[in-house]
C-alpha cells in the first residue's frame, strides 16, 4: 500500500525531515507550510492549524526572511529630492536610490520616481539642478506643456544646475517664468556647459 499523504500540519516520523516548502515548527513540533517568497506568516501554525500566509501590504517588502517565510515586512525606501530610483523594490528587496546625474532631477520623495531630464528651454531663467527642473523664461503664458505647469511672476530660487549658476542673457521679452510641476517619471538627460 502506498504511504498516506500527510497534510500540514503533521508530526514527522522520528529521524525524518519535513518536505519541500515545509518547515519544522519548534513550538508546535509539527511540519508546517512555508510561506512563498514575498509572503509572511500572519499566523504561525499550531498542532491543529497550518500557517496562515499573507503578502506584505503595497509599498512594503519582506525585510527579514526566515525558513517559515517572511518574519518582517518593512516600508519601501523613499528616494528624497535629488535622488531617483535606481532599482525598484520587489516583494523581497528594497528600493535602491541613486543621485540624479547632471542634467537630470527628481523633486519628489518617492519609492517609484526616477530621475528625469531637465526640460529644454529657449531661454533659461533658472538652471536646473539635481532636485529641481530648469525654469524657462516664457514668452507664451498660455503654454500647455505639462499638467500642473505654474507661471511665476519672478524666479523662486537661484539654486543652480551643476555648472551654470546664472540665468541666460536674453533679448526675448520676459513676461513670466514657467515652473513645471508635472508628472515625475524616467531619466537620462542633458549636460551643462
Amino acid at each position: 500500500l502506498p504511504a498516506q499523504v500527510a497534510f500540514t500540519p503533521y508530526a514527522p516520523e522520528p529521524g525524518s525531515t519535513c518536505r519541500l516548502r515545509e518547515y519544522y515548527d519548534q513550538t508546535a513540533q509539527m511540519c508546517c507550510s512555508k510561506c512563498s517568497p514575498g509572503q509572511h506568516a500572519k499566523v504561525f501554525c499550531t498542532k491543529t492549524s497550518d500557517t496562515v500566509c499573507d503578502t506584505c501590504r503595497p509599498g512594503w517588502y519582506c525585510a527579514l526572511s526566515k525558513q517559515e517565510g517572511c518574519r518582517l515586512c518593512a516600508p519601501l525606501r523613499k528616494c528624497r529630492p535629488g535622488f531617483g530610483v535606481a532599482r525598484p523594490g520587489t516583494e523581497t528587496s528594497d528600493v535602491v536610490c541613486k543621485p540624479c546625474a547632471p542634467g537630470t532631477f527628481s523633486n519628489t520623495t518617492s519609492s517609484t520616481d526616477i530621475c528625469r531630464p531637465h526640460q529644454i528651454c529657449n531661454v533659461v531663467a533658472i538652471p536646473g539642478n539635481a532636485s529641481m527642473d530648469a525654469v524657462c523664461t516664457s514668452t507664451s503664458p498660455t503654454r500647455s506643456m505639462a499638467p500642473g505647469a505654474v507661471h511665476l511672476p519672478q524666479p523662486v530660487s537661484t539654486r543652480s544646475q551643476h555648472t551654470q549658476p546664472t540665468p541666460e542673457p536674453s533679448t526675448a521679452p520676459s513676461t513670466s517664468f514657467l515652473l513645471p510641476m508635472g508628472p515625475s517619471p524616467p531619466a537620462e538627460g542633458s549636460t551643462g556647459d
Epitope: N122, V123, S140, P167, E168, S170, G182, P185, D193
Partner: antibody
Framework: EVQLLESGGGLVQPGGSLRLSCAAS????????MHWVRQAPGKGLEWVSA????????YYADSVKGRFTISRDNSKNTLYLQMNSLRAEDTAVYYC?????????????WGQGTLVTVSS | QSVLTQPPSASGTPGQRVTISCTGS?????????VHWYQQLPGTAPKLLIY???QRPSGVPDRFSGSKSGTSASLAISGLRSEDEADYYC???????????FGGGTKLTVLG
C-alpha cells in the same frame, strides 16, 4: 524671412570626426533653443541634440552622448555640431532646426540638411 | 522601434479625407505634452504642419487639422490633393528623454 543653412557634411571614416555648422538669419538667434535632428537614408526622424538660447545648457540623445558636442556662437548667429568617434549608424542627413516660440519641443523652421556618410 | 507609433502607410483618392494616427504612452502624449506634426515632401526637409495639437502655422491650409485625446493624437487631411503625397511625422516631449520623440512616419499616397 527665417533661414537656416547647414554645411560641413561629407564622407568620413569610422572613428573620424566632422564639424557641422548652421548659419541662421531672420530671427533673434539668442532667444531660441536650437536643435540638430537627423534622418538616416530611408528612415524616420531622430532628435540628436539641443542647446538653449544663451548656450548655458546642452541636451543630447543617449545615442550620441559623449561623442557629439553642440555649441553656438550668438555673435555669429551660428550653430555647431562637433561629431567625434563617428560610427556607420551616424550616417544620415543632419538638419538644424529652430525651437518654437514659447515651446522649444517643436521645430518651426528647418534647414535643408547636410549629408554625413560614415564609411570605410 | 519609435516611441510614438504611426501606421507606416495611408492612402486616399483626391478629394477624400484621410486620418493618420499617432499613439504614445503615459510618459509622452498621456502626460499632457503637446503633439506636433511635420510634413516631409519627397527629397525635401521636414516642415512644421501642426503645432500644439491643433494649431496651424501661417501658410498651412485649413484642410490640415490635428487633435489629441488621452495617449493618442491624429492628423486629418480633408479634400486630399496630389501635392499632399508625403511622409508625415508626429512628435512630442517625453518625460524619460532629453528631447522630443518622433513617430516612425506615415507615407501618404494619393491614388489616381
Amino acid at each position: 524671412e527665417v533661414q537656416l543653412l547647414e554645411s560641413g557634411g561629407g564622407l568620413v571614416q569610422p572613428g573620424g570626426s566632422l564639424r557641422l555648422s548652421c548659419a541662421a538669419s531672420g530671427f533673434t538667434f539668442s532667444s531660441y533653443a536650437m536643435h540638430w535632428v537627423r534622418q538616416a537614408p530611408g528612415k524616420g526622424l531622430e532628435w540628436v541634440s539641443a542647446i538653449s538660447g544663451g548656450a548655458t545648457t546642452t541636451y543630447y540623445a543617449d545615442s550620441v552622448k559623449g561623442r557629439f558636442t553642440i555649441s553656438r556662437d550668438n555673435s555669429k548667429n551660428t550653430l555647431y555640431l562637433q561629431m567625434n568617434s563617428l560610427r556607420a549608424e551616424d550616417t544620415a542627413v543632419y538638419y538644424c532646426a529652430k525651437g518654437g516660440t514659447g515651446d522649444p519641443y517643436y521645430f518651426d523652421y528647418w534647414g535643408q540638411g547636410t549629408l554625413v556618410t560614415v564609411s570605410s | 522601434q519609435s516611441v510614438l507609433t504611426q501606421p507606416p502607410s495611408a492612402s486616399g483618392t483626391p478629394g477624400q479625407r484621410v486620418t493618420i494616427s499617432c499613439t504614445g504612452s503615459s510618459s509622452n502624449i498621456g502626460a499632457g505634452y503637446d503633439v506636433h506634426w511635420y510634413q516631409q515632401l519627397p527629397g525635401t526637409a521636414p516642415k512644421l504642419l501642426i503645432y500644439r495639437n491643433n494649431q496651424r502655422p501661417s501658410g498651412v491650409p485649413d484642410r490640415f487639422s490635428g487633435s489629441k485625446s488621452g495617449t493618442s493624437a491624429s492628423l486629418a487631411i480633408s479634400g486630399l490633393r496630389s501635392e499632399d503625397e508625403a511622409d508625415y511625422y508626429c512628435a512630442a516631449r517625453d518625460d524619460g528623454l532629453s528631447g522630443p520623440v518622433f513617430g516612425g512616419g506615415t507615407k501618404l499616397t494619393v491614388l489616381g
